[in-house]
Amino acid sequence: SQPQAVPPYASENQTCRDQEKEYYEPQHRICCSRCPPGTYVSAKCSRIRDTVCATCAENSYNEHWNYLTICQLCRPCDPVMGLEEIAPCTSKRKTQCRCQPGMFCAAWALECTHCELLSDCPPGTEAELKDEVGKGNNHCVPCKAGHFQNTSSPSARCQPHTRCENQGLVEAAPGTAQSDTTCKNPLEPLPPEMSGTMLM
């Protein structure tokens, strides 16, 4: 029979015009319609009938154009594995999960399956910012010049050293990567250990 404009149509080379929305059915040697996201195959096609689709039942989904005879069961985000929900399951999309705050994805199989606590960054360092939160463990980098971080923490950020002059004070001790600048009132005497040294 002659190829038709719409499925089902005969295909001698086992390929279909629209790979996303059609599939090759080898038993009948035809191209048939796939079912749209949120639906499944209720009745398979034949030479004279196209696929019949039905809506996924509650708590199930199919994400793509498909020729599945069932919908996938929605699964909750497992808090024991360190996951939390960011978007609920719909007929067209599975539950969207991410690692809980302070955790990173330690096991990945198409999606994150297990999260672990982020490593602490020691004083004088901070976690390097990543494109996607929870994607990997912390990579600690030194605070850049003029900044400090004085705790062991997975999330603390390096802060700029205090500028004493902005507060009408003078510097008593310079800041380091692990501590802030120490300021003092300009009228106060130098501490004993600093007498005789010139503060720059």
């Epitope: 029979s1 209720s42 009745a43 030479r47 004279i48 009938r49 019949v52």
Partner: antibody, heavy 120, light 108 residues
């Protein structure tokens, strides 16, 4: 044992609508395609179309503009409406089950048929 | 649409004889998509053969089907009195589904 029974008026006036119902007993209407076929007196068989239990339909292009199928799963029934009838629509109307697993689309169980005459 | 032409129009045979009924299609029909039906007066058709050669449930083995492409045959190896009826072929390879005009098998 699945059985089919057609029902509806035996006479319809020209230009009016022919309405028939097929009742399925001894089994569920669900998960099957169902079909209507007609046979004018002393002539051959003409396929009218399919309906799936979910309501999906396929019609013979020659009748598509005049025909409507519907299904009522709660009553285990499916129905045919053919509008603007003429004398050429006089026929025995059969409902049947479509065998889609082994025979793909052959009709394995038939009703006994109901004669419909179009006459004023 | 595919036109199915059955021959002969009428076949006159005696019980015990062999009947050969022909169905020719206007274009090629996949052998999985051809069926044969038997119809007795005042009754609905009954499915005999589907897929050109597979017997439907409860059909005696004296009925057999064969053929491919455009030529198909229904054979009744040894006619019984209850076999005298009208026989239709049907294709469901291409929409719309079509039937042959029928072969009347009558007692000689």
């Amino acid at each position: 044992q699945v059985q089919l029974q057609e029902s509806g008026p035996g006479v319809v006036k020209p230009s009016e609508t022919l309405s028939l119902t097929c009742t399925v007993s001894g089994g569920s209407i669900s998960s099957y395609f169902w079909t209507w076929i007609r046979q004018p007196p002393g002539k051959g068989l003409e396929w009218i179309g399919y309906i799936y239990y979910s309501g999906s339909t396929n019609y013979n292009p020659s009748l598509k503009s005049r025909v409507t199928f519907s299904v009522d799963t709660s009553k285990n029934q499916f129905s045919l409406k053919l509008n603007s009838v003429t004398a050429a629509d006089t026929a025995v109307y059969y409902c049947a089950r479509v065998e889609t697993i082994m025979a793909f689309d052959a009709f394995d169980i038939w009703g006994q048929g109901t004669m419909v005459t179009v006459s004023s | 649409e595919i036109v199915l032409t059955q021959s002969p129009g009428t076949l006159s045979l005696s019980p015990g004889e062999r009947a050969t009924l022909s169905c020719r299609a206007s274009q090629s029909v996949g052998s999985s998509y051809l069926a044969w039906y038997q119809q007795k007066p005042g009754q609905a058709p009954r499915l005999l053969i589907y897929g050109a050669s597979s017997r439907a449930t409860g059909i005696p083995d004296r009925f057999s089907g064969s053929g491919s492409g455009t030529d198909f045959t229904l054979t009744i190896s040894r006619l019984e009195p209850e076999d005298f009826a009208v026989y239709f072929c049907q294709q469901y390879d291409t929409s719309p589904i079509t039937f042959g005009q029928g072969t009347r098998l009558e007692i000689k």
